[in-house]
Amino acid sequence: LSTCKTIDMELVKRKRIEAIRGQILSKLRLASPPSQGEVPPGPLPEAVLALYNSTRDRVAGESAEPEPEPEADYYAKEVTRVLMVETHNEIYDKFKQSTHSIYMFFNTSELREAVPEPVLLSRAELRLLRLKLKVEQHVELYQKYSNNSWRYLSNRLLAPSDSPEWLSFDVTGVVRQWLSRGGEIEGFRLSAHCSCDSRDNTLQVDINGFTTGRRGDLATIHGMNRPFLLLMATPLERAQHLQSSRHRR
Amino acid sequence: LSTCKTIDMELVKRKRIEAIRGQILSKLRLASPPSQGEVPPGPLPEAVLALYNSTRDRVAGESAEPEPEPEADYYAKEVTRVLMVETHNEIYDKFKQSTHSIYMFFNTSELREAVPEPVLLSRAELRLLRLKLKVEQHVELYQKYSNNSWRYLSNRLLAPSDSPEWLSFDVTGVVRQWLSRGGEIEGFRLSAHCSCDSRDNTLQVDINGFTTGRRGDLATIHGMNRPFLLLMATPLERAQHLQSSRHRR
Amino acid sequence: ALDTNYCFSSTEKNCCVRQLYIDFRKDLGWKWIHEPKGYHANFCLGPCPYIWSLDTQYSKVLALYNQHNPGASAAPCCVPQALEPLPIVYYVGRKPKVEQLSNMIVRSCKCS
Amino acid sequence: ALDTNYCFSSTEKNCCVRQLYIDFRKDLGWKWIHEPKGYHANFCLGPCPYIWSLDTQYSKVLALYNQHNPGASAAPCCVPQALEPLPIVYYVGRKPKVEQLSNMIVRSCKCS
């Protein structure tokens, strides 16, 4: 059952390395590596590192194995993030604080800046940092739909935990909708799952960015980790296939 | 960029056909095809055809693409089905009929007959025939947990439809649990999704097997299409690797 | 499964995932990818040793089928099964970019 | 995608899914599978024409990468991408059995 050819492992490795050279450039639609002549000196900006780490980290609720990729998904996706509008914004005043829900609003102008056209968006994740949780909690995510109506999106069963943990919800379809519409501010609601019989519907889970009365410096750190949308999209110029051998902004 | 070898398409087809011969036998762990000497004359029994058709049909809520298969899933899975205990059974009396839920109970002895050991089960689907539906309905599936408590399993948003349609819920983990436990009767509950604010929690969807006052002959057809568990499992003798070149029943 | 757990700790001659770490600077002569400095790309290698002919004794080879030719191919090939993405940070001019490259890391292989 | 829609209606020379109907009785000489009588098994065939060397002009071949070597393999191979199961009915003695065979029908191929 043997092939009788001796395999030159080093040659195979060299071929694989060369193929990877081409793979990376082709996924970025670059005919050659970008010059580094104008890269600012010093370490990477904090915000860029945070974004890179967000992308690198597998989080609860995200599938570990990618699906077989459609052709469009072969190419690299630019990753950006849009932080939730801070809770002192007046938009939050319209929604009565309840024991069973928290609200998260996003500025669509920021979303459009990151993703100019809905068709370019390949994935959008709502990421929430849940703090420690004493009891199991079943939560549901809703999308703000019209004046005061909410549309169910998905749910998650949260296990008790002693340490903070990032949660991720796939909200690609919703964000694509928002990009197509004219609204200025759009939002989500995270609620306790309410069964038809049960009356104990309190949202037990504590999401970073919603607790109050913090010391100033802590509040800033806290604010950095407030809910955000992680967006993966095809850059406009890459989508237009105008790149050929060009490195455009 | 060409390979410069002419491909003998007929040879490739012959090789593929021969490989399929081996593939089918190996998936069934047969060293040779089973003898047909004792096969009853005439067409296949109705129940067998119904089961074959259930397996062949893709249904709403079932993923179209298989995951990359784990090694154990290489081998063929025997398909059986266990119908829901009929609604006139006394078990249903314990659960008050409500506008927001319907109940489905299953005999675990029937399940054990089909799948003697939990580890043999590779997939279990709860299949329900939904009749026409005038409005969109968000439903949730629960598993009977302890005396009068229910554990949430999954949900589905049902679009309005003029024609009946099979729904499928993956309940593999639940059925595996049931096979491990000593209970005699186990069950599911299908409920309207209840939001914390909304009070209109009526289950609008009509599931075949629960409507009453039918003409006798129709009731039988109706009963045939009542909710059932479609089970895919490794036959015990195949799992024990005792088959080798034997055909055991 | 022919994954990193099994293949990296065995001397499997047949189809398996093989270790390969790519250091962008050393292996590709690139300094333009700022993060990561390199990654475990890995690759699939090894024969899918299967012989089919009309006079094959099925009883002998059927047991090997699952591993060596599960897809009943006319000429099975050792290829990636599970793949993972790789996020990178690089600059275009003065602007930093974070991009995710799909299917860059081979986690397991299969004969297909 | 190199699927049945594209491949069956084109004269693609490179990697593509090819039509193959298996009639259990005619092709395999079997009468023991009662349902179905046969099935569209299909298969993958065709070169994944890619040449890599250190002096390759990347600008010329990068556009072909997506199709011919998306996984950056050292030797890409035309293999199944999407597969579907096949349920069958057969008898063991007097007892009919319905069994599902995984990954039997090739719906699309890829260079991997």
């Epitope: 010059s35 902004r249 | - | 002569g29 003065r94 | -």
Partner: antibody, heavy 118, light 107 residues
């Protein structure tokens, strides 16, 4: 077709200033940096500086810091290079060139000869 | 600044000849080496970028190679329209610097 069209030749006295224009067409002006390069008679090419039409950000070669001024008018897709306190050794052909982030100049203007003579 | 040394500074050759021009950088420039052609009264033209990539529309008789600090431009079979001045340029580190040029003349 991508084109850069420069203004005509100039003759200037030492100490004076000169302003050369470069009109871009055939591409999105704000998507690429514009660079300026000069070539003295019989000499090689010398990089002077660049401007980012999108942000207005500028970078000069040390030699030209304080004497060269780069500007853009995005409404007309035109870049300008002004050189002040001219000396006779500033006599050269001045080129505008579109910069590709791959590290090269992919499109050049036809050049503008500036002669500094008393 | 990175110094770029081009050689030869001038070169006489005939139509059909194979010609090689070299460029040496004062430090490793990681393949960010480009070649340009200049003809009197015409705009400068990009020939090759990133060591070996042929710009669209440039004839395939032009090729580039090299790595580290040493790079080469080769014209496999000289054509009459190839007589011009050729410059190399490094795109690795600011300020961008050029070679002094090689004037290719008809023998």
């Amino acid at each position: 077709e991508v084109q850069l069209v420069q203004s005509g030749a100039e003759v200037k006295k030492p100490g004076a200033s000169v302003k050369v224009s470069c009109k871009a067409s055939g591409y999105t002006f704000t998507s690429y940096d514009m660079h300026w390069v000069r070539q003295a008679p019989g000499q090689g090419l010398e990089w002077m500086g660049r401007i980012d039409p999108q942000s207005g950000g500028i970078r000069y070669a040390q030699k030209f810091q304080g004497r060269a001024t780069l500007t853009v008018d995005t409404s007309t897709s035109t870049a300008y290079m002004e050189l002040s306190r001219l000396r006779s050794d500033d006599t050269a052909v001045y080129y505008c060139a579109r910069w590709d982030y791959g590290g090269y100049f992919d499109v050049w203007g036809q050049g503008t000869l500036v002669t500094v003579s008393s | 600044d990175i110094q770029m040394t081009q050689s030869p500074s001038s070169l006489s050759a005939s139509v059909g000849d194979r010609v090689t021009i070299t460029c040496r950088a004062s430090q490793d420039i990681y393949s960010y080496l480009n070649w340009y052609q200049q003809k009197p009264g015409k705009a400068v033209k990009l020939l090759i970028y990133y060591t070996s990539n042929l710009e669209t529309g440039v004839p395939s008789r032009f090729s580039g190679s090299g790595s580290g600090t040493d790079y080469t431009l080769t014209i496999s079979s000289l054509q009459p329209e190839d007589f011009a001045t050729y410059f190399c340029q490094q795109g690795d580190t600011l300020p961008w610097t050029f070679g002094q040029g090689t004037k290719l003349e008809i023998k």
